[in-house]
Interface confidence: low
């Protein structure tokens, strides 16, 4: 049984084996096109969410679509009904909180009076001066909370109280990517992961331990990718993992928050790195232990230097190391979490590409998370 | 100004080990990887491998994976590179050579070169 | 490993002339090539990085060009100084080859 399901994959009506490496190949090889159901699906990058929640408290502010403006929420007859669906509008399924916090001096956009039609919040139509001063603090979830802060030192081993959102996503059995969770369904990570194997039945995703090998395993229902632009091969190094199971949440299992849309980090920024790669450049081994270290944001325009990336960090990249080198994330951490800390642990970025590891001055690449939230919030309402 | 002193000439016999330092002055020693690059005489450059000052971690040529050892001592700002088994086709110049800033950046200083002539 | 291919392997030319070698890489490097220059008894030394940036208090005669496989070196005006052996190098992969190098003499 465990060699037939290891090589073979059983196709229904009528009952026949065919070999397991005709799964996800573009062909519909059983009859009921079985064969290609449970693969690595892309998913368009999709509208604009009408909703976002600012680095300014986790102010909520709602899109007026007929003039692409946006506007703050004020808090006046606020509801958790609207709060639910301004989470519901992203994704989350989880029970909000939220509060007001006073209108700061340097408030730029109009404030308004929100309400809601068909499931979307809108601005009230007669919307007077915001009379309660306040505007709407929302959380969609309790996240980048950690039993544990880290020590400011190079390179160091971790413990899953400090960073309980770290997973390790392994196929057939062996550490292939970090990750992080998201919320109890999903698991971010890099789509590049799945380059090679792109059936999501001997995918795996393991949380709540350190240790490489020791914690039991999660089956992965969905593994979402976003669709290639050739125009920017390295662009779009983003998957999102549904579990079949929500995970329970605990001390050592927890979700990272998202970065906010407005999360802009400037050079030299503190940042922190995670994962279980490997400790040398050409190889060496992959770590049993969890290893974290401090790293820092390395600008865009030094990072596309004709002596470094030559341009090819986009947009939606970001570059973290430290300029004397040395530390640096290496294969196997690829699609872990690059991570910052305010009120709140959040993943700013997904461990994506580089050139050698820990060099001086050669930065990672990594996918910047805050240029994805719209897709990532297409996903979760595709998927509610 | 940045100056990268090598270790003087050295005669050795076949099967024999040798050590040649290089002395790196004028910028910061950990900010740049050193490269070791040799050339047989009347013969082009052959690109040896990479060392990274800072955490001390290598890349070798597979030519040489083996027999080669590139190490380094931050305290004095210097480099080794080790090669073992010498045989009589390892007679060359060998240079270190930094690059510009980067792990892919072109070598911007070289050393003076160091002449090992192995001998039978 | 990514095989450099320079032509020609030699040539003579006057000072005055425009002299132009290309190398040629077995796989495409992006723009990750240099172009060196050496003189008999003395290390190389850089003149061309980036595929076409011009390494600072190197003549403003030298110039790189190219990108994938295909890359060229150009020196508009030949003086008698630059009478040498150059060589290209790829940076895109390791190890980081060299072509064979390129000896230009005097006519």
């Known amino acids: 049984k465990v060699i037939l399901d290891k090589y073979y994959f059983l196709c229904g009506q009528p009952l026949h084996f065919i070999p397991r490496k005709q799964l996800c190949d573009g062909e519909l090889d059983c009859p009921l096109g079985e064969d290609e159901e449970h693969c690595v699906k892309s998913f368009p990058e999709g509208p604009a969410v009408a909703v976002r929640l600012s680095k300014d408290r986790s102010t909520l502010q709602v899109l007026d679509s007929a003039t692409g403006n946006w506007f703050s929420a004020c808090f006046d007859n606020f509801t958790e009904a609207l709060a639910e669906t301004a989470c519901r509008q992203m994704g989350y399924s989880s029970k909000p909180t939220f509060r007001a916090v006073e209108i700061g001096p340097d408030q730029d956009l109009d404030v308004v009076e929100i309400t809601e039609n068909s499931q979307e919040l809108r601005m009230r139509n007669s919307s007077g001066p915001c009379l309660s001063g306040s505007l709407v603090s929302l959380h969609c979830l309790a996240c980048g909370k950690s039993l544990k802060t880290p020590r400011v030192v190079g390179v160091e081993e971790a413990s899953v109280d400090s960073w309980p959102w770290q997973v390790s996503i392994q196929y057939d059995k062996q550490h292939v990517c970090g990750g992080s969770i998201l919320d109890p369904h999903w698991v971010l990570t890099a789509a590049h992961c799945f380059r090679k194997h792109t059936d999501v039945f001997n995918w795996k995703v393991r949380a709540g331990s350190d240790k490489l090998g020791s914690f039991p395993s999660l089956a992965v229902a969905k593994i979402i990718i976003i669709e290639f632009n050739p125009m920017y091969p390295k662009d779009n190094d983003i998957a999102l993992m549904k579990l079949q199971f929500p995970l329970t949440f605990s001390g050592t299992v927890r979700p990272i928050c998202l970065p906010f849309f407005d999360e802009e980090l400037t050079p030299a920024t503190p940042l922190w790195i995670i994962g279980w790669g490997f400790t040398k450049q050409n190889g060496g081994k992959m770590s049993d232990i969890l290893l974290q270290a401090s790293v820092q944001v390395i600008d865009s325009t030094r990072c596309n230097a004709d002596d470094a990336y030559q341009g090819e960090v986009t947009e939606k990249m970001m570059c973290a190391g430290i300029p004397e080198g040395g530390v640096d994330t290496c294969q196997g951490d690829s699609g872990g979490p690059l991570m910052y800390q305010s009120d709140q642990w959040h993943v700013v970025g997904i461990v994506s590409w580089g050139y050698g590891c820990g060099g001086p001055s050669t930065p990672g690449v990594y996918t910047k998370v805050s240029a994805y939230l719209n897709w990532i919030y297409n996903v979760w309402k595709a998927e509610l | 100004q940045v100056q990268l002193v090598q270790s003087g000439a050295e005669v050795k016999k076949s099967g024999a080990s040798v050590k040649v330092s290089c002395k790196a002055s004028?910028?910061?020693?950990?900010?740049?990887?050193m490269h070791w690059v040799r050339q047989a005489p009347g013969q082009g450059l052959e690109w040896m491998g990479v060392?990274?000052?800072?955490?001390?971690?290598?890349s070798y040529a597979q030519k040489f994976q083996g027999r080669v050892t590139m190490t380094r001592e931050t305290s004095t700002s210097t480099v080794y590179m080790e090669l073992s088994s010498l045989r009589s086709e390892d007679t060359a110049v060998y240079y270190c050579?930094?690059?510009?800033?980067?792990?892919?950046?072109?070598?911007?200083?070289w050393g003076q070169g160091t002449l090992v002539t192995v001998s039978s | 490993d990514i095989q450099m291919t320079q032509s020609p392997s030699s040539l003579s030319a006057s000072v005055g002339d425009r002299v132009t070698i290309t190398c040629r890489a077995s796989q495409s490097i992006s723009s990750w090539l240099a172009w060196y220059q050496q003189k008999p008894g003395k290390a190389p030394k850089l003149l061309i990085y980036?595929?076409?940036t011009l390494q600072s208090g190197v003549p403003s005669r030298f110039s790189g060009s190219g990108s994938g496989t295909d890359f060229t070196l150009t020196i508009s005006s030949l003086q008698p100084e630059d009478f040498a052996t150059y060589y290209c190098?790829?940076?895109?992969?390791?190890?980081?080859?060299f072509g064979q190098g390129t000896k230009l003499e005097i006519k």
């Open positions: 004028g910028y910061t020693f950990t900010s740049y990887y």
């Open positions: 060392i990274n000052p800072s955490g001390g971690t290598t």
């Open positions: 050579a930094r690059g510009r800033g980067w792990l892919r950046s072109a070598l911007g200083y």
């Open positions: 190098q790829q940076s895109y992969n390791t190890p980081y080859t």
């Open positions: 980036a595929a076409s």
